[in-house]
């Protein structure tokens, strides 16, 4: 129970990609405002997004401090213009979020093919090491910096003239594949964390095809 003119937030949902992490909720406020708190299981509550009429709160700065921790958030509802007002139990109305462990749950962002180079019947495909929002020593760490050996990439490739796809995997950010001489190929990559139970795969990268600017062809 809360004050008669506030309603509790509901549908609290974490939206997170490459550790950019936003808590979303409903409803759109009518004559009320929200404040969000976030905590680790063992930590103190920290308030964010004070008295906002938004229904989202960017919690990236908090979760990147330790992406392997499990976080809980809660959204408080206050009457607009009377934020001191509390519910009948002496506390403002609030709702808890699901738990969220960024390292295990953040979505992997769409990767990008940085380059490809053909030398004879071999093609080297390089995946860009995407930047995350995890900062250490005033530097943003890359996806590989954060996940290390937990991160692999899958390459899908096919002849421009056919639809049959082949796949390759790498523990690094580079693939070396065999191709048929004189054929043009198209490529797409996907980031994967095989050890995860949820959000294991990114969306596929944009397709890049030989004979376009990004690649380089060398006849040997």
């Amino acid at each position: 129970s809360g004050t008669t003119n506030t309603v509790a937030a509901y549908n609290l949902t974490w939206k997170s990609t490459n550790f950019k992490t936003i808590l979303e909720w409903e409803p759109k406020p009518v004559n009320q405002v929200y404040t969000v708190q976030i905590s680790t299981k063992s930590g103190d509550w920290k308030s964010k997004c004070f008295y906002t009429t938004d229904t989202e709160c960017d919690l990236t700065d908090e979760i990147v401090k330790d992406v392997k921790q499990t976080y809980l958030a809660r959204v408080f509802s206050y009457p607009a213009g009377n934020v001191e007002s509390t519910g009948s139990a002496g506390e403002p109305l609030y709702e808890n979020s699901p738990e969220f462990t960024p390292y295990l749950e953040t979505n992997l962002g769409q990767p990008t093919i940085q380059s490809f180079e053909q030398v004879g019947t071999k093609v080297n495909v390089t995946v860009e090491d995407e930047r995350t929002l995890v900062r250490r020593n005033n530097t943003f760490l890359s996806l590989r910096d954060v996940f290390g050996k937990d991160l692999i990439y899958t390459l899908y490739y096919w002849k421009s003239s056919s639809s049959g796809k082949k796949t390759a995997k790498t523990n690094t950010n580079e693939f070396l594949i065999d191709v048929d001489k004189g054929e043009n190929y198209c490529f797409s990559v996907q980031a994967v964390i095989p050890s995860r139970t949820v959000n294991r795969k990114s969306t596929d990268s944009p397709v890049e095809c030989m004979g376009q600017e990004k690649g380089e062809f060398r006849e040997i």
């Epitope: 090491d129 530097t139 760490l141 290390g148 050996k149």
Partner: nanobody, 129 residues
């Protein structure tokens, strides 16, 4: 799991130089960031330096910044620590470690960093005054 073997430790005069090497085998070496930690007698293990998987980013403890240089050669599966202008307080057992860069840097904040999954056996460095 990567197996790591350090070498290059020994006795040096204050102001002198040493070059430590760490050779890795096993899992793909070029996926890991590499770091050096050290432990002096009676003290906790402390972070010295780290280098990311590609060699493009390096990180140092304040106590060694400007004197030590970390580098790597992925073709040789080896990471190096060039120690110049050494001081008696650099005396310690130096350990090589392989992990994600995040784990190494967070280990540096939290002390020993012992949850990193691959450690060498260590090489002794002694600096005499």
């Amino acid at each position: 799991q990567v197996q790591l073997v350090e070498s290059g430790g020994g006795l040096a005069q204050a102001g002198g130089s040493l070059r430590l090497s760490c050779a890795g085998s096993g899992r793909t070496f070029s996926t890991d960031a590499m770091g050096w930690f050290r432990q002096a007698p009676g003290k906790e293990r402390e972070f010295v330096a780290a280098i990311n998987w590609s060699g493009g980013s390096t990180y140092y403890a304040d106590s060694v910044k400007g004197r030590f240089t970390i580098s790597r050669d992925n073709a040789k599966n080896t990471v190096y620590l060039q120690m110049n202008s050494v001081k008696p307080e650099d005396t310690a057992v130096y350990y090589c470690v392989a992990d994600s860069l995040l784990a190494l840097l967070d280990g540096s904040r939290g002390g020993p960093g012992t949850d990193s999954d691959s450690w060498g056996q260590g090489t002794q460095v002694t600096v005499s005054s």
